[in-house]
């Protein structure tokens, strides 16, 4: 006997009560492949999740996170809270970065200022906890009539303006 | 491939007590901290406890000191967690995983590995 359930198409389900009619997936839920023996129940984005595609009978529906928060996991299957810049998730919740290192984003870590000196440069703007240092020329760079031959003047390190 | 797979949760009455377990596979286990962290249904991700590779050291959030209690067996390749006097607020989906780093109570999540979650709910 041919099994009559490979027929059913995505979006329908292969009912053994109905002599292996395909019936269609019933409301919230769905078959992404054909030849299902049951629909799978859809996803519901709610609390801290928020819809941004909504469950049809071929497909399952797709969650986000609402403001304030960003997905973590596959399919977003958790949310994360965001931090402000100048701050990095700790385990207990946002912490300001710590002296000599900053985060420009809402997420991630605290990651330490460049260090202008290891390219032989100087500290043109300091860094705060917010943004990076910029580096710039030396001053033997700026100094003049300085030739390439001019060994560079020993630059500053990266500094912290007050908050 | 590196995966972690929980199991344990459910249904359970206010009072009552669930133990968790995560079975690891695909990396060396002995040689990382691990966490439990969870999603409770209406706000963000949420770290819960923390125990550093040898099962020396434990963390936890000041929500669940004293009543929940992680613990490791690195011959078993499983993590544990031991909740007791389990309240409303626990219901959540809860996670294990794999730390990159030391696995203090304060570090960043220095998360590498999640795995599935498992649901827990606490009702009566």
């Known amino acids: 006997l041919q099994d009559l359930c490979s027929n059913c198409p995505a979006g329908t389900f292969c009912d053994n009560n109905r002599s292996q009619i395909c019936s269609p997936c019933p409301p919230n839920s769905f078959s992404s492949a054909g030849g299902q023996r049951t629909c799978d129940i859809c996803r519901q984005c709610k609390g801290v999740f928020k819809t941004r595609k909504e469950c049809s009978s071929t497909s399952n529906a797709e969650c986000d996170c609402i403001s304030g928060y960003h997905c973590l996991g596959a399919e977003c299957s958790m949310c994360e809270q965001d931090c402000k810049q100048g701050q990095e998730l700790t385990k207990k919740g946002c912490k300001d970065c710590c002296f000599g290192t900053f985060n420009d984003q809402k997420r991630g870590i605290c990651r330490p200022w460049t260090n202008c000196s290891l390219d032989g440069k100087s500290v043109l703007v300091n860094g705060t906890k917010e943004r990076d240092v910029v580096c710039g020329p030396s001053p033997a760079d700026l100094s003049p009539g300085a030739s390439s031959a001019t060994p560079p003047a020993p630059a500053r390190e990266p500094g912290h303006s007050p908050q | 491939e590196v995966q972690l797979l929980e199991s344990g949760g459910g249904l359970v009455q206010p009072g009552g007590s669930l133990r968790l377990s995560c079975a690891a596979s695909?990396?060396?286990?002995?040689?990382?901290?691990m966490s439990w962290f969870r999603q409770p249904p209406e706000t963000g991700l949420k770290w819960v406890s923390s125990?550093?590779?040898?099962?020396?050291?434990?963390y936890y959030a000041d929500s669940v000191k004293g009543r929940f209690t992680i613990s490791r067996d690195n011959s078993k390749n499983t993590l544990y967690l031991q909740m007791n006097s389990l309240r409303a607020e626990d219901t959540a989906v809860y996670y294990c995983?794999?730390?990159?780093?030391?696995?203090?109570?304060?570090?960043?999540?220095?998360?590498?590995?999640w795995g599935q979650g498992t649901t827990v709910t606490v009702s009566s």
């Open positions: 125990i550093d590779a040898s099962g020396g050291d434990t």
């Open positions: 995983a794999k730390e990159g780093s030391h696995g203090t109570d304060d570090s960043h999540y220095d998360v590498d590995v």
């Open positions: 695909g990396f060396t286990f002995s040689n990382y901290a």
